[in-house]
Amino acid sequence: MAVTACQGLGFVVSLIGIAGIIAATCMDQWSTQDLYNNPVTAVFNYQGLWRSCVRESSGFTECRGYFTLLGLPAMLQAVRALMIVGIVLGAIGLLVSIFALKCIRIGSMEDSAKANMTLTSGIMFIVSGLCAIAGVSVFANMLVTNFWMSTANMYTGMGGMVQTVQTRYTFGAALFVGWVAGGLTLIGGVMMCIACRGLAPEETNYKAVSYHASGHSVAYKPGGFKASTGFGSNTKNKKIYDGGARTEDEVQSYPSKHDYV
């Protein structure tokens, strides 16, 4: 029951996390510009991974995509890649984990197969979460180190000069969404990996048994308490032999008529 709960909770947490990673990747507010008093109008500028926007004091908002890759910093491309890899891995992980859920029966799928799938999806969630956290952190580092706020390289040409607008950028909402979502996906992945251990416990042979004389003859079959791994024929964890043979812990627990001669 605990295993099913852990697995189910891990799935739900990862699902929320991956939804958050997708939301963060699509959001425009990765970096936001402090309300900058442009002489013309108060301009609020914010940027995402795919486009940048400007909102005027009048409420007018305009967004445009980055039409060229050439003018974009390499770090932005790296962040894009990390977030996309995170989404893809997370999506595959979700797909795998659906079939791995203990509460869902698909054909005659054995517990060992479900355990393997749970572990696979768990690892995928962990990597997905790490990708998202890494992507968001790289972008945040760009802001902290004033990546584009450094002294503008002004150059003159036939049309005068061009410069990058010197404005102060702060962390946008998408960064916080990304960090939280990445963390949730990571936690969900860890929970799936923990659940995997419960789904397929290690094979245990209780070999230390004491024998007592029994009134009726029985045929002893070794490995009576073999834990189920899905590979053996005893898949229901039933005692194969239960006629007078007890584990060491059970000896002298219940006196019987055979103990006294």
Epitope: V40, N45, S52, V54, S58, G65, Y66, G71, V165
Partner: nanobody, 120 residues
Framework: QVQLVESGGGLVQPGGSLRLSCAAS????????MAWYRQAPGKGLEFVSG???????NYADSVKGRFTISRDNSKNTLYLQMNSLRAEDTAVYYC??????????????WGQGTLVTVSS
């Protein structure tokens, strides 16, 4: 390559009028913020007038009621109509385009300037 080329400057008597033009190439004249700035001899850059993509228009207090900013999207040109000119309006006038959207780096483009001299 982005180019902003100002024209229309010259010598004018006090109370006269001039119309400055800023022809843009490589950039949309309906950019996020288009503006006129001026720099009087021995002084710093001063904002004159500007308009935004959203239609907001603003003027410096010193030119309100005398100057009018406009743009012609079909010609990709920004204009500054200057009436009732005074001696203190003598300066080099610069055209400026600030781009925030469609670029990861907000950019500010400047023309080479056109000289306006108000003198009797």
């Amino acid at each position: 390559q982005v180019q902003l080329v100002e024209s229309g400057g010259g010598l004018v008597q006090p109370g006269g009028s001039l119309r400055l033009s800023c022809a843009a190439s490589g950039v949309d004249i309906s950019s996020d913020v288009m503006a006129w700035y001026r720099q009087a001899p021995g002084k710093g850059l001063e904002f004159v007038s500007g308009l935004t993509r959203g239609g907001s228009i603003n003027y410096a207090d010193s030119v309100k009621g005398r100057f009018t900013i406009s743009r012609d999207n079909s010609k990709n040109t920004l204009y500054l109509q200057m009436n009732s000119l005074r001696a203190e309006d003598t300066a080099v006038y610069y055209c400026n385009a600030e781009i925030y959207t469609g670029t990861f780096y907000p950019r500010s483009y400047w023309g080479q300037g056109t000289l306006v001299t108000v003198s009797s």
